[in-house]
Amino acid sequence: LPVCGQPSRALPNLVKRIIGGRNAELGLFPWQALIVVEDTSRIPNDKWFGSGALLSESWILTAAHVLRSQRRDNTVIPVSKDHVTVYLGLHDVRDKSGAVNSSAARVVLHPDFNIQNYNHDIALVQLQEPVPLGAHVMPICLPRPEPEGPAPHMLGLVAGWGISNPNVTVDEIIISGTRTLSDVLQYVKLPVVSHAECKASYESRSGNYSVTENMFCAGYYEGGKDTCLGDSGGAFVIFDEMSQRWVAQGLVSWGGPEECGSKQVYGVYTKVSNYVDWLLEEMNSPRGVRELQVER
């Protein structure tokens, strides 16, 4: 079985905070998936992007809001599987020749995903065909199923492309979370913020911002471009010293209304450890269970 959470190229030991992110070398984030949704059922046709993380040869983990049809109402309806394309082993979005692209066999949103507050913002894509694993395409580990999630001050990495498109409106950019700087995969290192501090920072804002127990926050009090970098649905990964593997502890979910990088605007992530049982249940075909790896 392929090992999860162990890229063929060692992730650098970043001791200093990265401002504005830096280019990821090919193979640094082999679990990173680009998810392209072209929703032809919308009028006019709608197209947006997100990220995801490979869990096995057949399953991609992502945020539910990436795969929710961008409707004119608050109803949660998934996009059709026919409108989803997943790219793996991708480095530069302008050159997809070296990447593996796959269509979706199933799109599964968490049944309790709440569009009002983004609670339970987690989803799965089952790929039409299992993808060949290799140096540039490898799965990430799932965390142990526990409600605590990552501890404050733990450092994690989040990567994303943030497709920049001059024709996309600000609203579309905000919805799809595609706010970054480069067509080459970027990554940043961010500290986990205490739940109390994050809740307080959002409660002080006007608007309905609830940071639930199914979320955690990461970022820097003083702000900086780093909080912009992850595409929605991308994995916030933390290195587990015990198993010596990278683990998907979070998924890029949402942030405040201010420009990203504003002071005391933390990024909010889905707490993956709360959903391990649900994920395993959804992937319970013999193939899914055999392939799946959870950090123990």
Partner: antibody, heavy 114, light 112 residues
Framework: QVQLKQSGPELVKPGASVKLSCKAS????????INWVKQRPGQGLEWIGW????????KYNDKFKDKATLTVDTSSNTAYMDLHSLTSEDSAVYFC???????WGQGTLVAVSS | DIVMTQSPSSLAVSAGEKVTMTCKSS????????????LAWYQQKPGQSPKLLIY???TRESGVPDRFTGSGSGTDFSLTISSVQAEDLAVYYC????????FGGGTKLEIK
């Protein structure tokens, strides 16, 4: 082109039930929900409920929970609404709509009279 | 339940005039995650099915003339017709889709 074709007018007795249909064409029926709306003569619009054909999920206006039952038949791309225990208050035109209200049926008049 | 209140209930204007009607919701329709106000405007001409004019409070539906403009956020919304035409004779409804759906009572537009 997209069309929602509703069944013809119904004259029914108080206490009876009636089943209205809404046949969709010109788009993939399972990609969007079907909404049902009531309009009494000379009155405004009232949302009854919706059904999502891909998984038969339904949501109802509390006021119509015991009055209406929504179903679909994906093999014929048709949505149905059963109205039960009819009274004169149920006399109205009933509309179906889809693709987020971009398209509407022509309406079905239901008259409840003894 | 979210209650939608429209005013006025009716109004009569001459062709070419500007008209504004309002819609108030009993709670905010702004989704802080998607940054959208889930409010739509419909036009219903006599004997016809309703027609969607505006969604997300201010986005004009494809094919709707640009004399129709929606505005507002949170709980207060308005629909403006910059230069009323004879064919605009209709009842106009607002509808919230923030939590299920609720229509306003309607504003009847008559042409003098």
């Amino acid at each position: 082109q997209v069309q929602l074709k509703q069944s013809g007018p119904e004259l029914v007795k108080p206490g009876a039930s009636v089943k209205l249909s809404c046949k969709a064409s010109g788009y993939t029926f399972t990609t969007d929900d079907i909404n049902w709306v009531k309009q009494r003569p000379g009155q405004g619009l009232e949302w009854i409920g919706w059904i999502y054909p891909r998984d038969d999920r339904t949501k109802y206006n509390d006021k119509f929970k015991d009055k209406a039952t929504l179903t679909v038949d994906t093999s014929s791309n048709t949505a149905y609404m059963d109205l039960h225990s009819l009274t004169s208050e149920d006399s109205a035109v009933y509309f179906c709509s889809s693709l987020e209200d971009t398209y509407w049926g022509q309406g079905t008049l239901v008259a409840v009279s003894s | 339940d979210i209650v939608m209140t429209q005013s006025p209930s009716s109004l009569a204007v001459s062709a070419g005039e500007k008209v504004t009607m309002t819609c108030k919701s009993s709670q905010s329709l702004l989704n802080s995650r998607t940054r959208k106000n889930y409010l739509a405007w419909y036009q219903q001409k006599p004997g016809q099915s309703p027609k969607l004019l505006i969604y997300w409070a201010s986005t004009r539906e494809s094919g709707v003339p640009d004399r129709f403009t929606g505005s507002g956020s949170g709980t207060d919304f308005s629909l403006t017709i910059s230069s009323v035409q004879a064919e605009d004779l209709a009842v106009y409804y607002c509808k919230q889709s923030y939590n299920l759906y609720t229509f306003g009572g309607g504003t009847k537009l008559e042409i003098k």
